[in-house]
Interface confidence: medium
């Protein structure tokens, strides 16, 4: 079953290559287990950036080597992606799945365009 997901259109990563955005979903029921996946679309290719499953009211748990962290609040997830470079600029899509209890719902946002600008190297000082 389909579900509405919203996310901001544009986000600019900071000078340390970190970008944060919010993903909000309309929960048709009282989901207790939610899975959030961040997908990156660039040059018509879609790749999975990170994913986490969490119990409502608990922290999101990503894999240890994940570049993502996040927190949840109600029907909203605050996602942070770290270690971004200019080449990582692209459309980052939030996919939300209500895993439990049934019925299963899935929604995909329109995507957040994340712009990453590599910092200029500091000039050598004599």
């Amino acid at each position: 079953k389909a579900m509405h997901v919203a996310q901001p259109a544009v986000v600019l990563a900071n000078s340390r290559g970190t970008a944060s955005f919010v993903c909000e979903y309309a929960s048709p029921g009282k989901a207790t287990e939610v899975r959030v996946t961040v997908l990156r679309q660039a040059d018509s290719q879609v790749t999975e950036v990170c994913a986490a499953t969490y119990m409502m009211g608990n922290e999101l748990t990503f894999l240890d080597d994940s570049i993502c962290t996040g927190t949840s609040s109600g029907n909203q997830v605050n996602l942070t992606i770290q270690g971004l470079r200019a080449m990582d600029t692209g459309l980052y899509i939030c996919k939300v799945e209500l895993m439990y209890p049934p019925p299963y719902y899935m929604g995909i946002g329109n995507g957040t365009q994340i712009y990453v600008i590599d910092p200029e190297p500091c000039p050598d000082s004599d």
Partner: nanobody
Framework: EVQLVESGGGLVQPGGSLRLSCAAS????????MGWFRQAPGKEREFVAA????????YYADSVKGRFTISRDNAKNTLYLQMNSLRAEDTAVYYC????????????????????WGQGTLVTVSS
């Protein structure tokens, strides 16, 4: 500074319909939760309905559930309140309000969580 301007109020007979609009200036409209409140003559201002920043989740006072529908068009920076099956007790000045923090998940009906208010538009339900 964002400005909120309501319109669409007027005189309507019981059982009739009205659609209120709230036009917001500025480019940050889509980042904020929005709400409608109303104040009847001699009464305190009360919560009517609210909508989340992305337009995904909506919330209503029990007194208007099933009769009023809140919606938003982020491309047009406009908030709406469709009011059907109007009753005499819906007579009030209707205010739109902007949430206090971008991408908030407070989902509150408390007036204190809204940072900006319009001037209001009068809705009179009478035969």
């Amino acid at each position: 500074e964002v400005q909120l301007v309501e319109s669409g109020g007027g005189l309507v007979q019981p059982g009739g319909s009205l659609r209120l609009s709230c036009a917001a200036s500025g480019r940050t409209f889509s980042s904020y939760d929005m709400g409608w409140f109303r104040q009847a003559p001699g009464k305190e201002r009360e919560f009517v309905a609210a909508i989340s920043w992305g337009g995904v989740n909506t919330y209503y006072a029990d007194s208007v559930k099933g009769r009023f529908t809140i919606s938003r068009d982020n491309a047009k920076n406009t908030l709406y309140l469709q009011m059907n099956s109007l009753r005499a007790e819906d007579t009030a000045v209707y205010y739109c309000a902007r949430g206090s923090a971008p991408y908030s998940s407070s989902r509150s009906s408390a007036q204190e969580t809204y940072a900006q208010w319009g001037q209001g538009t009068l809705v009179t339900v009478s035969s």
